[in-house]
């Protein structure tokens, strides 16, 4: 459909509330340091302009693309260069280069303090102005996560508001709010990581990589839907995510709503698990579909070998309709294996493709590819064994101990990576234990590998900004589906020149005593990384001793009447002790 005014079209489709929310998200994701009030002003101006276009689509500037309108707004900010430096250089470019330039300036690791929930203050804000409260939530999440899936953020904002509606009435606001906010925070962080991986796959590996990922995932979830149906959804979904990852948030939200409508209208041919999703309002409906439980497998699935090994036309299909044929293979294999991770399914499809590429050029192709399915077993065994070993280690060490083991493992593999990144990534990798190891056997593999893909993507995104390790670059860029096996296969870096011992790194202060437990852990784990960068060959025993001594030293000083005085006296002794242990 063609519309005279794109902005009027989106305003009418989305309605004022969602339109304003999405515009706020868009600006917050680009200008991550601007105060909330400045964004509100921009949103107000864009909304007023959109309303004039709704009233008269021929009005001045209403025919301009949304990129042009948004870009002009950003470039009109007087303090742009002062606050954002070379982002202002984008304004010298023409569309579409200007928008591409803005996208490249999004910061995945902005220097914004962590949000600390204060129940009393938050309830006061909530009760004073619900609309502002909703907007502030969108702003705070969007600026910290510049690739957050915008329509999904609108959904989380509704949930957030609901939590406050309930808890601000409670006698003990904190007891009601804090666990609910923490639970929501975890969901939001997972959602951010999932979307960041989707955007990375589209931007770094192309739309086909994303479509393959989606085809496998949807085939697992909707095994009753036929290939053509799944392919249609995959195509539409790719468009939605391409738009959101590209900053076209209004179009993305609009198209996502259309896709949810289509899925619900055709749920009979897609899945039996969508009924209750489709009765919900739009944002809840889309979220519910995305999280829908796996449908049961059809009872009459025939052996895959019939279609992909035994048939005489395998090479004809491969040569004449390669992408479609490999797509049907991935679809058929995935729907039969809900227990496999998406990455594993894609690795299997790659092996199938490589085998046909080789065999179809030979004298006797059927004899050559007859055993292709046997090649898949090692691919399945590798992650299964790895997960088994790591879950055993997790059971033995507990979450904190398991994180520390991963800190040691990864710092030895890639010691060049910055300490905050190593701590963040290893801590997140360590959470795979509590997330997945308790799951039933048939869920462990997909849970663990799909989660690890999210965490390793975070490492890749951070490393790309300031590349320091060729090994990391190689694992991140060579193959999306082999990232995890690539990192798993890395061995300690023997070429690394140890860091000088810097005493300041191991200087601690009284503030350590009042830190929440997780922040205390981060301090200790930061010291552990620094220790390993200084002594990469430190033994497990030495590290255990140092960590034990550190815990004792902190406990002693936090129990002392004058914390700071104790740290000043005991700190240097602790440093000497460390050097002695590691000598």
């Amino acid at each position: 459909d063609t519309y005279k005014s794109e902005i009027a079209h989106r305003f009418k489709d989305l309605g004022e509330q969602y339109f304003k929310g999405l515009v706020l998200i868009a600006f917050s994701q680009h200008l991550q340091q601007c105060p909330y009030e400045e964004h509100v002003k921009l949103v107000r101006e864009v909304t007023e302009f959109a309303k004039t276009c709704v009233a008269d689509e021929s009005a001045e500037n209403c025919d301009k693309s949304i990129h042009t309108l948004f870009g002009d707004k950003l470039c009109a900010i007087p303090s742009l260069r002062e606050h954002y430096g070379d982002l202002a250089d984008c304004c010298e470019k023409e569309e579409p280069e200007r928008n591409e330039c803005f996208l490249q300036h999004k910061n995945d690791n902005p220097d914004i303090p962590k949000l600390k929930p204060d129940p009393v203050a938050l309830c006061a804000d909530f009760q004073e102005d619900e609309q502002k409260f909703w907007g502030k939530y969108l702003y705070e999440i969007a600026r910290r996560h510049p690739y957050f899936y915008a329509p999904e953020l609108l959904y989380y904002a509704i949930i957030y508001k609901d939590v406050f509606s309930e808890c601000c009435q409670a006698a003990d606001k904190a007891a009601c709010l804090l666990p609910k906010i923490e639970h929501l925070r975890e969901k939001v962080l997972t959602s951010a990581a999932k979307q960041r991986l989707k955007c990375a796959s589209i931007q770094k590996f192309g739309e086909r990589a994303f479509k393959a990922w989606s085809l496998a995932r949807l085939s697992q979830r909707f095994p009753k839907a036929d290939f053509t149906e799944i392919s249609k959804i995959v195509t539409d979904l790719a468009k939605v995510h391409k738009e959101c990852c590209h900053g076209d948030l209004l179009e993305c939200a609009d198209d996502r709503a259309d896709l949810a409508k289509y899925i619900c209208e055709n749920q009979d041919t897609i899945s039996t698990k969508l009924k209750e999703c489709c009765d919900k309002p739009l944002l809840e409906k889309s979220h519910c579909i995305a999280e829908a439980k796996r449908d049961e497998l059809p009872a009459d699935l025939n052996p895959l070998e019939h279609d992909f090994v035994e048939d005489k036309e395998v090479c004809k299909n491969y040569k004449e309709a390669k992408h479609v044929f490999l797509g049907t293979f991935l679809y058929e294999y995935s729907r039969r294996h809900p227990d496999y991770s998406v990455s594993l399914l894609l690795r299997i499809a790659k092996i199938y493709e490589a085998t046909l590429e080789d065999c179809c050029a030979k004298e006797d192709p059927p004899a050559c590819y007859a055993t292709v399915f046997d090649k898949f077993q090692p691919l399945v065994d590798e992650p299964k064994n790895l997960i088994k070993q790591n879950c055993e280690l997790f059971e033995k060490l507990g979450e904190y101990g398991f994180q520390n083991a991963l800190i040691v493992r990864y710092t030895k593999k890639v010691p060049q990576v910055s300490t905050p990144t190593l701590v963040e990534v290893a801590r997140k990798l360590g959470l795979v234990g509590s997330r997945c190891c308790k799951r039933p056997e048939e869920e462990r593999l997909s849970c663990a590998e799909d989660y690890l893909s999210l965490v390793l993507n975070r490492l890749c995104v951070l490393h790309e900004k300031t590349p320091v390790s060729e090994k990391v670059t190689k694992c991140c860029t060579e193959s999306l589906v082999n990232r995890r096996p690539c990192f798993s296969a890395l061995t300690p870096d023997e070429t690394y020149k140890p860091k000088e011992f810097v005493e300041g790194t191991f200087t601690f202060h009284a503030d350590l005593c009042t830190l929440p437990e997780d922040e205390k852990q981060i301090k200790k784990q930061t010291a552990l990384v620094e220790l390993l960068k200084h002594k990469p060959h430190a033994t497990e025993e030495q590290l255990r001793t140092v960590l034990g001594n550190f815990a004792a030293f902190v406990q002693k000083c936090c129990a002392a009447p004058d914390h700071e005085a104790c740290f000043a006296v005991e700190g240097p002794k602790f440093v000497i002790e460390i050097r002695g242990i590691l000598a």
């Epitope: 036929d226 290939f227 025939n302 019939h306 309709a321 479609v324 049907t328």
Partner: nanobody, 126 residues
Framework: EVQLLESGGGLVQPGGSLRLSCAAS????????VAWFRQAPGKEREFVAG????????YYADSVKGRFTISRDNSKNTLYLQMNSLRPEDTAVYYC???????????????????WGQGTLVTVSS
């Protein structure tokens, strides 16, 4: 639900020609591969020819290669089998079959095709 209805069968002399049609209906039928099978008295159903859905690809049994041509007209949702140089051994009931949502013919095993027409009889005799 896919529905298939064959027509165009009849009696023809050896060396003659015949054109079979299969009217197909159902969701995404234009993106579904459709095949022709045949069954001679006392024999198993055998694959004759097939055509991709949304993909330009055709398939033939060795016994009919060069004599039969399969085609489709998506605007009419119709599949055709042009049969030339007919032989007595081509005598059989010809069936149209589909596996919904499958854009390619990935198997000639009749049991894997859930949807069938009622068949049209072709007799080649002098």
């Amino acid at each position: 639900e896919v529905q298939l209805l064959e027509s165009g069968g009849g009696l023809v002399q050896p060396g003659g020609s015949l054109r079979l049609s299969c009217a197909a209906s159902g969701r995404y039928i234009d993106e579904t591969a459709v095949a022709w099978f045949r069954q001679a008295p006392g024999k198993e159903r055998e694959f004759v020819a097939g055509i991709g859905g949304g993909v330009d690809i055709t398939y033939y049994a060795d016994s009919v290669k060069g004599r039969f041509t399969i085609s489709r007209d998506n605007s009419k949702n119709t599949l055709y089998l042009q049969m030339n140089s007919l032989r007595p051994e081509d005598t059989a009931v010809y069936y149209c079959a589909a596996r919904p949502g499958q854009p390619l013919i990935t198997s000639k095993v009749a049991d894997l095709y859930p949807y069938w027409g009622q068949g049209t009889l072709v007799t080649v005799s002098s």
